[in-house]
Structures are given as C-alpha cells and as structure tokens.
Interface confidence: low
C-alpha cells in the first residue's frame, strides 16, 4: 500500500493549472513517433506564449547501432529505425534570450526561462486531458539545506576542469528543489561480513563507530537531492558469514538479497540493506539492483570495503544505494554536479556530489511510487545514531524534532528547544497526525496501489500509520493469468508496457524461445562469471523480457540497445539497457511472473509455484469474504470483520487499522 | 461502512445552478478520493467530476468543463458539486462515490467502492 500521492503543489506558493495545445499537428493523445520540432501554446499569468521546441539531436544519434555476437564469434550489427525520443531544447517566441528545456514524454515536464521570470511545468497528477501545472521557480517553497560540500570544496574541484563551467552546487540545489521538495527518509541497514570485520581486529565498537561514521557521510552527501540517510540497523557476521560469498559479485548479490528477504527484514524493517565486505571481485567495487528501494526482495547492495579510507568508500556505498534508489550511471549522459566526476560515474572515484541526472533518476522513481516506503519518517527507536536536538531526526528520548530554531517557528506543535510535544499536542508528525492531533481511527493513511495490495488506516492512537502490508504472495489476479508478488501483479504484458508503451504486450512463446537459447546479451537466463546463460527452453520466459506491437522507444534516462527479432510472423522485441557489471538488468522477466500453470520465474528459472508458501485457503480461514495478506491475516472485504470475516463489520484485517471509528466525532462540527 | 447520502437536486429551469451535496456517515472521509457520475434514462452511467482526498486536484468531464465546480469539506466529511449555467441535457440522477485507490482513475466507475442512492436533476428548457 502507498501513501495517497497528492503531494504535487504542497511546495508551492501559488500556480496555474493549464491545458497546453500543440500547434504543429494534433495535441498527442496515444502513443506515436515524437516529433522533431513541436510548437505549443502554454498559458501563464493570463499571457499565452508559443514556445517552439526542437528534438535534443544528440541524445540518440541517427546512427544508433546495436552490436551483438553469435555463437561463432562474429560481430553482428543492427540499428533499429526508432528515433523518437521525447527529450527537447527551444525558445519562447518573441522573448529575447529565452531558453527551454522540456521532455515531452509523458506530458511537458521542465523550465521556461523568460526574461524576467523562470517557469516549472510538470503533468497534472491524475488528469487524463493534458492539464499541466506551471508555477514560477520563486513560488518554489525552499525549505533550508545543508549542502554536503562546501563552497571551497566547490571552487577546489571545480578550478581542475576549467574548460567547462558546471552549475554551482547553490544553482544545482535551487533547481533540484523545484522536483523534490518533500523530505525522502532511508531506512538503512548495514551487515558487515567476516573477513571486514576480522581486519578491524575483530572489535565490535570500532565497527560500529565506522559505520555510524559511513552513515553520516551518507547524509551529508544525500542531503542535496532532500534525502536523509537513517542508519536503523547494523549487524556484523561476527561467527562467519551467513551467505556464500564465493563466486562473482552478481552471485553474491543474489544470496544477500535472499538471505535479506528470508531473515533480515522479518527482524527488522528498513528500507535498503547494504553488505559491507572486505573480498573484492576484480575492479567491481559493488553491485546493486536498480529502483528497488521499497522492494522485499530486491533493495540491496553488496559494497567492497578493502584498503581504502571510510571517506572514499562511502561514495562507494552512495553510488549504490543511488541504483536501489533508481540511478543509473552518468557516463555517456548529459549531466552536471558541480565537480569534475559524479556519484554516480560508473567508476568508483569518490566524488560526494550527485548530478543533475541522478536527481532526474530519483525523481522518475519517486513519481512512479517506487519510492513510498521512503516517505515515512522513522520513529526515535528505529534511529541508529547519536540523538541530537534540532538534526530534524526524532531520535531516542525526543517526541519531535523541528529543527533549527527558525524552522521550528513555524512548527505548530513541537517545542523546538526541548525536543518534546507542546502541551496540548499529542502529536507533530507522521501520517496520522493533523493539526496535532491524531487522526481519527479508520481514517485511511496508505491506499492500495495495485490488486494485489490492501489499505491501512489510522489507528486513533498513533501517528503513524499501520505498518504496509499486501496480498500475500501466490495469490492469483489478473483474472487468475498471474500471481502476486510483493504487492504486485506480476505478467508480461504489464512489463512490456513499462518497457515499450501502453499498446506494447507479451511476444509469443516462440519469441522467448528462440532469442532466450542464444546466450548473448540479448537472449539470456542470467550471467555466471563472464558467462551469460542460455536458457534451457523450460526457462525460457523466465529470462530477456520479449515483446511485441512496440510503439515506443523506452526512455529511462539512458539510451538502452534495442534488438528486433523476427519470428514466426511477428517482432520480438528486447532491451538491453546497458546499465554496466554493478547492475542486474532491468530487460529481464520479473520475479514472480506466472511461466506457466502452476509455475513462477525465480532466479531466470520457471519454478513450481509452491516456491511462494502460499497457504491460504480463503474459503476456510476467511469464510469466502477476504484474502490472505503478508502476515497470513486475513483482509476482509466491506461488510465483514476481521479477524476471520466470518462476522458482520466493516472489512480490514488485524493488520490494517480499524477501518471504522464508533465515536467519529473528530472531523464532524 | 461508509454511506454516502446526496442531497440538494430538484427541478431548475435553463441556465439556473444547483449545489449537490455528499455527506459520508459513521466513517471518517479522509482519504477517500470522490467522484460525482450522473445517469439519465436509457443511458450509461457518466462520469461528471472528480476530487482527490486532499482537495487539492480536480478532474471534470468536457461537457461539464467550466460549468461545474466539485469542492469538499473534510471536516464537515461532505463533497460538493456547484452547478451553472444548466442545460437540459444536465437531466439525470446524479451519484456521488468514494474510492480508496491510489491512482484514482478518476472516470473509471468501477474502481468507485461505495456509491450513494443518486439524487435526481431536472433541467427544463
């Protein structure tokens, strides 16, 4: 379940809702080849402007190749006829030294700089008539910052490359506000492993202090893209390891993951788990999935911590926390941080500034809700760190934390000096918290994103809302065609979709079949070594993702390679987003995607379902009135109670709050 | 369970406004996003308007656009459709619905989970 996402003008002092028109052809309504050059009308302040915008030629060259290798050896070469990207540069007409830069990919979303004023344009949340939103950068609330780098820092790195002049981090940081004005907060857990901590001469303390130490590094370098880092866990493997650390890092990484899943989180809930070892894997300095921040099975990192300072190894450890947190890698992208190399470059060179591009990454994340669970601020027992008052952290012994003196003159229920409520609040944040006051019980706090998710709700007594829970694994949706699967309904066609537009679906088997035995980047069941593995045709549509009716070139931010296919009378459609060693590949088929009848795509292999322990018989446990969620409780429909949905109610689960509020007398007049 | 009850139709002439109200009882309203769907005889049920559980964004459909104005109150758990300029063809039985699903798709009555009983408007020419 996620947090009900209308948060799109809170930062804003005033704006417009607009419905901009295009003047060369029809408005775009579906999917089509994006135009070279496009005019549109936008209004703003009561003046229409024309702005006239040309396709950024040199994101996706005309020249665009794909090499792939057959079985022999020999070098293939393709370029697919697709050049219709929807990234854009331009002017306002008849405004002397305007200047725009705009996407055009799923609405307009970018600046206007006018003469006197800059514009922010983004889609409206919701609106299915191209209404837009436009607001001018100063009614941009700006929340105060503490920038990770300091000015001399700055003019330090900066003065090495003098040919370019990147953004200062205070413009970098201006412009970032517009895009991510709510606070995000990461959940971190750390495990340490054997070897690391046996060349910290097995002392825990010391341990302990460095990684508290890494944490804080993390904030400081985090804080300019508005995320906190919150150190809620550590744990060090101080018997031995409890993975198998043989094998390359993908391998690796895959066991942590599992072992996170099946053991870490039941313990302790957080956001991203990242494994700190000493063993290196020949110049990988680490792997990570990318965009899986809130995943159950999928958010970590494994990080390699060997003869290099905590400092240095913390922007390893940023850079990919940044992949959970959906950033890719910059090379080869147009993007700035004010410093000669980035987070974010593929090469671990211990830069602590994060660029424009890696702020773009988390912002696509975040407005595809792939960042919900990052939302809540975590309670002062979660908080792994020295407690401070007015660090905005509510730590151990606090009952609030407004920050900085100023900042908690506008907080109307927390006590900035003390750290504790004023005395006639109950409480000053969280998402069941309004006016100070706890919101009623059965007031609903996290919606249902999906089929396969459920809602909580309010409890009457907490300011938080009830931990987030879903439909447990296994259980079937989308008309019994695929199963959930950590709150969502795994099938192909809803993946091809995200990969190649909404008129896009699943290829036929034979697609699967054909490209997925090759064992080549683009026909795979995975990569051991320096190996990727054929898929045995059993496994086949558990490996590279095949599509057909593809309309649309994918845009994530970088250009994938893209690879058609012939068969059998259609285009098999794949991808290889070229995402570098360090990062799973997104083409692949996911997790928990139904293979066949009976079966799920586990680890590229097409598995009996029995894999998920799905053990619900709704009928018998939940009286045919509900379902099963990930705590195996029953989540019963309207009209029935929990705990088994056999009596009459108000549907819910033991889980998700009351649903109902007897005495609701709190909103009323 | 949340009951929605409308309230405020009746017979206006052309060119005349109407204020429809929804008022949910026995739960609190937070958090719903709603919806108002109108349904004339002999026809589909239509989407009129839309407002998320905040208040803070809007959706209506084209041939109300300009017209109709959906608000709501949170504290008094009520939604409101303010409606001008009526035309005969605004004729039906107007439903309010509530939904808790995040990506309210704001037309699609069918990820509506409660409905109200409707209240009937008559526009005459």
């Known amino acids: 379940a996620a947090r009900p996402g209308f948060q799109q003008t809170s930062h804003l002092s005033s704006y417009e809702i607009i419905t901009p028109w295009r003047l060369t052809r029809e408005r775009r309504e579906a999917p089509r080849p994006y135009s070279k050059q496009v005019s549109y009308v936008i209004q703003a302040e009561g003046k229409e402007h024309i702005i006239h915008l040309e396709r950024n030629k040199d994101l996706l060259p005309e020249d665009f190749v794909v090499y792939t290798y057959n079985k022999e050896g020999t070098l293939i070469t393709d370029h697919p006829n697709i050049q219709n990207h929807c990234h854009y540069r331009g002017y306002v007409e008849g405004v002397h030294n305007s200047s725009i830069a705009l996407s055009d990919c799923f609405g307009l979303r970018g600046l206007l700089h006018l003469e006197n004023a800059s514009y922010g344009i983004e889609p409206l949340q919701n609106s299915s008539h191209f209404e837009h939103i436009i607001y001018r950068m100063d009614d941009v609330y700006k929340e105060p910052l503490k920038c990770g780098v300091s000015n001399k820092d700055i003019e330090k790195e900066t003065a090495k490359d003098e040919e370019e002049e990147p953004p200062s981090m205070t413009q970098l940081l201006r412009r970032r506000r517009a895009v991510l004005p709510q606070t995000r907060y990461v959940e971190l857990f750390i495990v340490v492993d054997k070897e690391r901590y046996d060349m910290m001469g097995r002392n825990q303390t010391a341990v302990r202090e460095e990684m508290i130490l890494l944490a804080n590094y993390l904030d400081s370098m985090y804080i300019m893209l508005n995320i906190r880092i919150v150190l809620v866990g550590l744990e060090i493997w101080t018997n031995g390891n409890l993975i198998n650390i043989v094998g390359g890092a993908g391998d690796v990484l895959g066991n942590f993951v599992q072992w996170r899943e099946k053991f870490l989180i039941t313990r302790r809930r957080h956001d991203s788990a990242q494994l700190v070892l000493k063993k290196g894997f020949g110049g990988t300095a680490g792997m990570a999935f990318v965009g899986t921040v809130c995943s159950r099975s999928h958010a970590g990192g494994i990080n390699v911590f060997g003869q290099i300072t905590v400092e240095t190894f913390a922007s390893i450890v940023a850079h990919e926390l940044g992949h959970n947190l959906g950033m890719n890698h910059d090379d080869g992208r147009d993007c700035s941080c004010g410093a000669k190399s980035c987070i974010m470059n593929s090469g671990a060179s211990g830069s602590r500034n994060f660029s424009s591009c890696s702020a773009e990454d988390f912002e696509k994340l975040t407005l595809n809700k792939g960042g919900n669970c990052l939302l809540n601020i975590p309670k002062p027992d979660e908080a792994y760190s020295a407690p401070s008052c007015g660090n905005k952290l509510v730590d151990a012994g606090e009952e609030c934390d407004c920050g900085t003196p100023k900042e908690c003159e506008l907080d109307p229920c927390c006590e900035g000096s003390t750290c504790k409520l004023k005395s006639f609040a109950e409480c000053a944040y969280g998402d069941c918290c309004k006016d100070c006051r706890f919101l009623p019980g059965g007031t609903l706090c996290r919606g249902k994103t999906s089929e396969c998710d459920v809602p909580e709700y309010c409890n009457g007594s907490s300011q938080f809302c009830q931990p987030d829970v879903f439909i447990q694994n296994g259980y079937p949706c989308q008309n019994n065609k695929a199963y959930c699967y950590n709150g969502m309904c795994q099938y192909y066609d809803a993946q091809c979709q995200v990969i190649f537009g909404s008129k896009a679906k699943a290829a036929p088997k034979d697609c699967f079949i054909e490209v997925n035995s090759k064992g080549d980047r683009f026909g795979n069941c995975g990569f051991s070594g320096n190996e990727y593995k054929k898929c045995a045709t059993g496994n086949a549509l558990c490996g590279k993702l095949q599509c057909e009716n593809v309309q649309e070139i994918p845009v994530f931010g970088i250009v994938p390679a893209i690879i058609q296919t012939p068969s059998r009378g259609t285009k098999c459609w794949g991808v290889d987003f070229q995402l570098g060693s360090d990062v799973p590949d997104p083409g692949m088929v996911n997790e928990g995607t139904k293979c066949g009848a009976g079966k799920i795509c586990r680890n590229f292999q097409c598995v009996d379902a029995s894999v998920l322990n799905y053990d619900c018989d709704v009928q018998k446990k939940c009286h045919g009135h509900g379902v099963c969620n990930s705590n195996k409780n029953c989540h019963c429909e309207n009209g029935w109670a929990p705990p088994n949905c056999e009596t009459k109610g108000y549907g819910g689960s033991v889980d998700s709050g009351p649903t109902y509020n007897e005495m609701n007398t709190a909103l009323r007049d | 369970e949340v009951q929605l009850v409308e309230s405020g139709g009746g017979l206006v002439q052309a060119g005349g406004s109407l204020r429809l109200s929804c008022t949910g009882s026995?739960?609190?309203?937070?958090?719903?996003?709603m919806g108002w769907f109108r349904q004339a005889p002999g026809k589909e049920r239509e989407f009129v308007a839309y407002?998320?559980?905040?208040?803070?964004?809007?959706n209506y459909a084209d041939s109300v656009k300009g017209r109709f104005t959906i608000s709501r109150d949170n504290a008094k758990n009520t939604a409101y459709l303010q409606m001008n300029s009526l035309k005969p063809e605004d004729t039906a039985v107007y439903h309010c619905?509530?939904?808790?699903?995040?990506?309210?798709?704001?037309?699609?009555?069918?990820?509506?989970?409660?409905w109200g009983q409707g209240t009937q408007v008559t526009v005459s020419s």
């Open positions: 026995d739960r609190t309203f937070i958090g719903y996003h």
């Open positions: 407002i998320s559980s905040g208040g803070a964004y809007s």
């Open positions: 619905a509530a939904t808790d699903y995040n990506k309210a798709y704001a037309r699609e009555g069918r990820r509506y989970d409660y």
